[in-house]
């Protein structure tokens, strides 16, 4: 008996071939001997089966001695043995229809679990293997689960169902809802305008939800909410914003926040959360602000940074085009009695400059100029 695997919702063609290459009488029946379809001369005739409106054949192939049964919009319950009667002989085809669906929604938050469930006909014992977009293979029976979805899991999952040495392939598009970056650091000189951007790693037709940016300033004992906002069909509207600092927010995606001035009291870490409509859980992105200040007070030239810096970052003070006068893995460095000229304060990571501030030291009889 020939075995054919089909996919729920798909169309399948069951073939039946006669030795004579011409149109002759044929009938297709199910295992209960109920007629599905056949021919009467050149006309297609249909029987009383439950497939009536979903069964078809191809007239143009009859003249070649081919009498296919085509079943559209396959259902699991279409799984059956189908019998083609032609030229006093019977051809049997066993059709097995499978379905593979994602647990609830195919749009899942980062960190959530994906469960794929296989629908299969009674008496079948299929095996399933799925391959994620990043090439990870998972195997299982009726259900397959992947916990802790990551951004790289977004895309097409290809699942192969094996039964009777035959296979059928399913493709499921999964969208992991997340920000493009889990964390980002912005380095700014005191007084500069700060731009925070929170690009999403997915695109959907309509995006509705609400969000908030909580900020933990390095100098503050507790965190506070800097801004709350709503998102409706990709349009952003601010609900509430603190007076200090007075953040501004872009009206369109990607989410964009502007801090008018980088000041030491703002240096610290923020957590932007976004709750999407009809989704349990929230999207998170951490953002960090590091602020640098270079000052000269009497005979002391000082460079300081505030905010979350890693211990391996180097803070240096150097006279332009000269070797660093002082270089430390600390958040403040200074030079006593600095010589006149343009001094540079540099925050660097393995030789790569992250932030620099220049200060002009004038001869001792005059006051310093900050460019």
């Amino acid at each position: 008996k020939k075995v054919v695997l089909g996919k729920k919702g798909d169309t399948v063609e069951l073939t039946c071939t006669a030795s004579q290459k011409k149109s002759i009488q044929f009938h297709w029946k199910n295992s209960n001997q109920i007629k599905i379809l056949g021919n009467q001369g050149s006309f297609l005739t249909k029987g009383p089966s439950k497939l009536n409106d979903r069964a078809d054949s191809r007239r143009s192939l009859w003249d070649q001695g081919n009498f296919p049964l085509i079943i559209k919009n396959l259902k699991i319950e279409d799984s059956d043995t189908y019998i083609c009667e032609v030229e006093d002989q019977k051809e049997e085809v066993q059709l097995l229809v499978f379905g593979l669906t994602a647990n609830s929604d195919t749009h899942l938050l980062q960190g959530q679990s994906l469960t794929l469930t296989l629908e299969s006909p009674p008496g079948s014992s299929p095996s399933v293997q799925c391959r994620s977009p990043r090439g990870k293979n998972i195997q299982g029976g009726k259900t397959l689960s992947v916990s802790q979805l990551e951004l790289q899991d977004s895309g097409t999952w290809t699942c192969t169902v094996l039964q009777n040495q035959k296979k059928v392939e399913f493709k499921i598009d999964i969208v992991v809802l997340a920000f493009q970056k889990a964390s980002s650091i912005v380095y700014k000189k005191e007084g500069e305008q700060v731009e925070f951007s929170f690009p999403l790693a997915f695109t959907v037709e309509k995006l509705t939800g609400s969000g908030e940016l909580w900020w933990q300033a390095e100098r503050a004992s507790s965190s506070k909410s800097w801004i709350t906002f709503d998102l409706k069909n990709k349009e952003v509207s601010v609900k509430r914003v603190t007076q200090d600092p007075k953040l501004q927010m872009g009206k369109k995606l990607p989410l964009h926040l502007t801090l008018p001035q980088a000041l030491p009291q703002y240096a610290g870490s923020g957590n932007l959360t976004l709750a999407l409509e009809a989704k349990t859980g929230k999207l998170h992105q951490e953002v960090n602000l590091v602020v640098m200040r270079a000052t000269q007070l009497q005979k002391n030239l000082t460079c300081e940074v505030w905010g979350p810096t890693s211990p391996k970052l180097m803070l240096s003070l150097k006279l332009e085009n000269k070797e660093a006068k002082v270089s430390k893995r600390e958040k403040a460095v200074w030079v006593l009695n600095p010589e006149a000229g343009m001094w540079q304060c540099l925050l660097s990571d393995s030789g790569q400059v992250l932030l620099e501030s220049n200060i002009k030291v004038l001869p001792t009889w005059s006051t310093p100029v900050q460019p």
Epitope: G6, K7, D10, T11, V12, E13, G41, S42, F43, L44, D56, R58, R59, S60, D63, I70, I71, K72
Partner: antibody
């Protein structure tokens, strides 16, 4: 809902080979045949040929010697190759799904053969 | 090959009119016939299949009849959007063939 998107070169010189590809979205290739049809002011609508998921083909005898239709099931795509084109092959080429009737259709690609 | 002949090649009518288009096959094709509508710059659209079955989403003012060699497409009450070219197609045998079309124009 199945949609067909087609592409390929629109301007050819005589004796060159016409190549068009059609991608199936919102469904799979299984169970149906997938056809190419062309339409020119002189000849009207002309069926070129068809292919199914297994690669089984049927061609119009008038074009059979120059036509190859192929299928790429991994991409849900099928393609048309027509060799040794002449000005008479200038037409709008459509890809379409078929059991006995043609539905749906691609948007069509105008192919002009000119020296 | 089976030849499909449509008549008339063009017809003028007004909104609200009842219009009948005909298609003749050069040999018996039972009911293996479809009708398509095509508007300028667009692909043909399936209206009727198996001679008389209305394709899903097609307005009920369209109807088809016939069997064997003679077939008709009737539009019971013409609407502005119905002005187009109509083609018949046989699916009885390879190669599939189409009629040359009937252009339905506004009077």
């Amino acid at each position: 809902q199945v949609q067909l998107q087609q592409w390929g070169a629109g301007l050819l010189k005589p004796s060159e080979t016409l190549s068009l590809t059609c991608a199936v979205y919102g469904g799979s290739l299984s169970g149906y045949y997938w056809s190419w049809i062309r339409q020119s002011p002189g000849k009207g609508l002309e069926w070129i040929g068809e292919i199914n998921q297994s690669g089984s083909t049927n061609y119009n005898p008038s074009l059979k010697s120059r036509v190859t239709i192929s299928v790429d099931t991994s991409k849900d795509q099928f393609s048309l190759r027509l060799t040794s084109v002449t000005a008479a092959d200038t037409a709008v080429y459509y890809c379409t799904r078929v059991l006995n009737w043609f539905d749906p259709w691609g948007r069509g690609t105008l192919v002009t053969v000119s020296s | 090959d089976i030849q499909m002949t449509q008549s008339p090649s063009s017809v003028s009518a007004s909104v609200g009119d009842r219009v009948t288009l005909t298609c003749r096959a050069s040999q018996d094709i039972s009911n293996w016939l479809a009708w398509y509508q095509q508007k300028p710059g667009k692909a043909p659209k399936l209206l009727i299949y198996a001679a008389s079955s209305l394709q899903s989403g097609v307005p009920s003012r369209f109807s088809g009849s016939g069997s064997g060699t003679d077939f008709t497409l009737t539009i019971s009450s013409l609407q502005t959007e119905d002005f187009a070219t109509y083609y018949c197609q046989q699916a009885n045998s390879f190669p599939y063939t189409f009629g040359q079309g009937t252009k339905l124009e506004i009077k």
